[in-house]
């Protein structure tokens, strides 16, 4: 590895109203020549490591979280690994970790607050 992948998320919690959609922002800086085939992206619940959503082998592997999550596929190649969580519920409140692996890896946690 040449150095950790820098993963950036907002410092402040994302606040969402019950029933609305929330975007958990996560970004990384792709190196020149980066291709989506190299990308392993995993969103997980921070506390339990339960899989929420993943992208690997060049394709979106889909939601593992009640089919309420989606990536922004057209923006992934530019380093936007954000996750859309639809129809937010009270039980969704907590910390989500964005794990990005290319040749090396990095991760960061973002908090969701439900109002």
């Amino acid at each position: 590895p040449t150095g950790a992948v820098e993963v950036q998320v907002p410092e402040d919690p994302v606040v969402a109203l019950v029933g609305t959609d929330a975007t958990l922002r996560c970004s990384f800086s792709p190196e020149p020549g980066f291709s989506l085939a190299q990308l392993n992206l995993i969103w997980q619940l921070t506390d339990t490591k339960q899989l929420v959503h993943s992208f690997t082998e060049g394709r979106d592997q889909g939601s593992a979280y009640a089919n309420r999550t989606a990536l922004f596929p057209d923006l992934l190649a530019q380093g936007n690994a954000s996750l859309r969580l639809q129809r937010v519920r009270v039980a969704d409140e907590g910390s989500f970790t964005c794990f990005v692996s290319i040749r090396d890896f990095g991760s960061a946690a973002v908090s969701l607050q439900v109002a």
């Epitope: 950790a4 993963v7 921070t46 339990t48 490591k49 899989l51 592997q61 890896f105 991760s107 960061a108």
Partner: antibody, heavy 116, light 108 residues
Framework: QVQLQESGPGLVKPSGTLSLTCAVS?????????WNWVRQSPGKGLEWIGE???????NYSPSLKSRVTISIDKSKNQFSLKLNSVTAADTAVYYC?????????WGQGTLVTVSS | EIVLTQSPGTLSLSPGERATLSCRTS???????LAWYQQKPGQAPRLLIY???SRATGIPDRFSGSGSGTDFTLSISRLEPEDFAVYYC?????????FGQGTKVEIK
Amino acid sequence: QVQLQESGPGLVKPSGTLSLTCAVSGGSISTSNWWNWVRQSPGKGLEWIGEIYPTGNTNYSPSLKSRVTISIDKSKNQFSLKLNSVTAADTAVYYCARGWNYFDPWGQGTLVTVSS
Amino acid sequence: EIVLTQSPGTLSLSPGERATLSCRTSQSINGILLAWYQQKPGQAPRLLIYGASSRATGIPDRFSGSGSGTDFTLSISRLEPEDFAVYYCQQYGSSPRTFGQGTKVEIK
């Protein structure tokens, strides 16, 4: 390239506190990664102990949670492990490692023996 | 916690032979959440495979990983002298992260 190096006493008395430090070189400990402790008892397998994020957030193994504290010192580019009320069962090689999911790289490990 | 069971405990093979190591998980996990490590005596573990099938940086292509659900496999197509070691699988789909008990690949 990130490298890790464990240091600390190789012998701890029963009921005492095991204290180890992991120095990170070749990169900043403030990067977006979790920093872990894993141990391996003599002739046995690997056991994850816990981890810390640069913000200070921690996660611990449920079986050790009541006895473990992991801290981070960003100014010294290092993180530390404290395990209290140790017994002979805590005798192991202790490794530090980088990673949130899988671990890479690892330190070379340091043997800690619990004995009077 | 998820328990990982590796088999066989020991595999006795000759250089040039193919090695097939098994890792079973007590609960089904997504393949993206499994890794393999190699450990030689007196050394720290070394990451070989992550995401069940992706080789880590610098790992030769004779190492390959596969599997899904509860059954995962690490294959070494042609054993080189430096491949004789202990191999561990590890899951990261549930906390705490857990390891298998290891498979020792020894020279026959």
